[in-house]
């Protein structure tokens, strides 16, 4: 996201819209306490960041409250009253959404539905990944609305499952960021496992009736 | 397909005023920020004005700022650039463009804009 | 305001050659340089976003590279559609602009 200006990197990740977090990484001022100097508005004055992040003891980054805002955020970084890098974005390209909530799985014979809680907002990507101990690698499907069904796995084998949120790179562009995974989850003939085996099992011999 | 078209060009008089439209489709209109960017006949590229998704932040070249008013109708997929007190420097090709911060992949055919007595 | 500045501001080539085109800044813009094609008539295309991403669909004989101040576009091997006019746009911090544009026509 950030060549360099003056040697500073930055990085904006706008998480589930709601808040801004800028972060930058300045080997020129390493151990300088930059500060942050930013506004939603070209014409209102800059205002100091008020919740700072802090490494080994100085200033790396800032999170701003901004809940839904889709305008630009002006912004300046600054050692004392000298300014290293400023520049304007849209905020809302680099969106990350919040991780997945209430993640439910319906099954049915070879096939389960997974469902969690949409997003308040739009243009987003559901990803259910899966694999199972046989599988080398996760299978992925994905979705407009959290509402993914997979089919064609194999009642006898364990499966693992995560989910996350993407947002749509024809929407937002590149710039965005998926969200966290959910927790791995982990099923066996419709039913919860802690665990998948790691090594797979030999499938249980077929009982004659 | 991503789609945008512009229209409301046409000759008029320094002093006076025009709208121009750009007509969306083939994406979420209200998701994205749009632009006004403009080409004088034979010259560069300038970039007039901006719209962020919801209407509710406009940005403008300092050029054109007082008289021009970019503005957007999100339920019908429309883009607007209200162009007063217009001057002959005004005189040129107007384009809506779709972009982010990372350039702009998204652009109308333009519509020519002439300012003469 | 950022001002843009493109060199050279037309020059002639040959279908095959190599053909680079300078941008530069007047002042440090990071990597928020963008790169278009504009043939006559019609609306710009977008090249190559973030100094040195190629976008979708444009073909791998374009590329981008710099940070900083200067910047550079290549067409490693010139084609007869790639006879147009190339601008550089600053997307560092709004107001948003453009170099003046490099004209690349048929020697």
């Known amino acids: 996201q950030g060549g360099a200006a003056e040697g500073v990197q930055i990085q904006i990740i706008y998480f589930n819209l709601e808040t801004v977090q800028v972060t930058w990484n300045a080997s020129k001022y390493s151990r300088t306490n930059l500060t942050f100097h930013y506004r939603f508005n070209g014409d209102e004055a800059y205002d100091q960041c008020t919740n700072y992040l802090l490494q080994e003891g100085h200033t790396s980054g800032c999170l701003l409250d901004a809940e839904q805002r889709d305008d630009i955020l002006y912004f300046s970084i600054r050692n004392g009253t000298h300014p290293v890098f400023t520049a304007s974005r849209w905020m809302v390209y680099y969106l990350k959404p919040s991780s997945p909530k209430h993640v439910r799985f319906s099954w049915h014979q070879d096939a389960v539905t997974v469902t969690c809680s949409d997003l308040s907002y739009g243009d987003l990507l559901y990803e259910v990944q899966y694999r199972s101990p046989f599988d080398t690698e996760w299978q992925s499907k994905q979705e407009n609305t959290c509402n993914v069904t997979i089919e064609g796995l194999d009642a006898e084998k364990c499966y693992s499952f995560w989910v996350r949120v993407k947002a749509m790179e024809d929407v937002y562009g590149p710039d965005t960021y998926p969200s966290d995974w959910s927790e791995v989850t982990c099923w066996q003939r419709g039913e919860i496992r802690d665990a998948c085996a790691e090594t797979p099992t030999p499938p249980k011999p077929k009982l004659s009736k | 397909e991503v789609q945008l078209l512009e229209s409301g060009g046409g000759l008029e008089q320094p002093g006076g005023s025009l709208r121009l439209s750009c007509a969306a489709s083939g994406f979420t209109f209200s998701s994205h920020a749009m632009n006004w960017v403009r080409q004088a006949p034979g010259k560069g590229l300038e970039w007039v004005s901006a719209i962020s998704g919801s209407g509710g932040s406009t940005y403008y070249a300092d050029s054109v700022k007082g008289r021009f008013t970019i503005s957007r109708d999100n339920s019908k997929n429309t883009l607007c650039l209200q162009m007063n007190s217009l001057r002959a420097e005004d005189t040129a090709v107007y384009y809506c463009?779709?972009?982010?911060?990372?350039?702009?992949?998204?652009w109308g055919q333009g519509t020519l804009v002439t300012v003469s007595s | 305001d950022i001002q843009m500045t493109q060199s050279p501001s037309s020059l002639s080539a040959s279908v095959g050659d190599r053909v680079t085109i300078t941008c530069r800044a007047s002042q440090s813009i990071s990597i928020y340089l963008n790169w278009y094609q504009q043939k006559p008539g019609k609306a710009p295309k977008l090249l190559i976003y973030?100094?040195?991403s190629l976008q979708s669909g444009v073909p791998s004989r374009c590329s981008g590279s710099g940070s900083g101040t200067d910047f550079t576009l290549t067409i490693s091997s010139l084609q007869p559609e790639d006879f147009a006019t190339y601008y550089c746009?600053?997307?560092?911090?709004?107001?948003?602009?453009f170099g003046g544009g490099t004209k690349v026509d048929i020697k």
């Open positions: 973030a100094a040195s």
């Open positions: 463009a779709r972009g982010h911060n990372s350039g702009w992949p998204y």
């Open positions: 746009q600053q997307s560092y911090s709004t107001p948003l602009t």
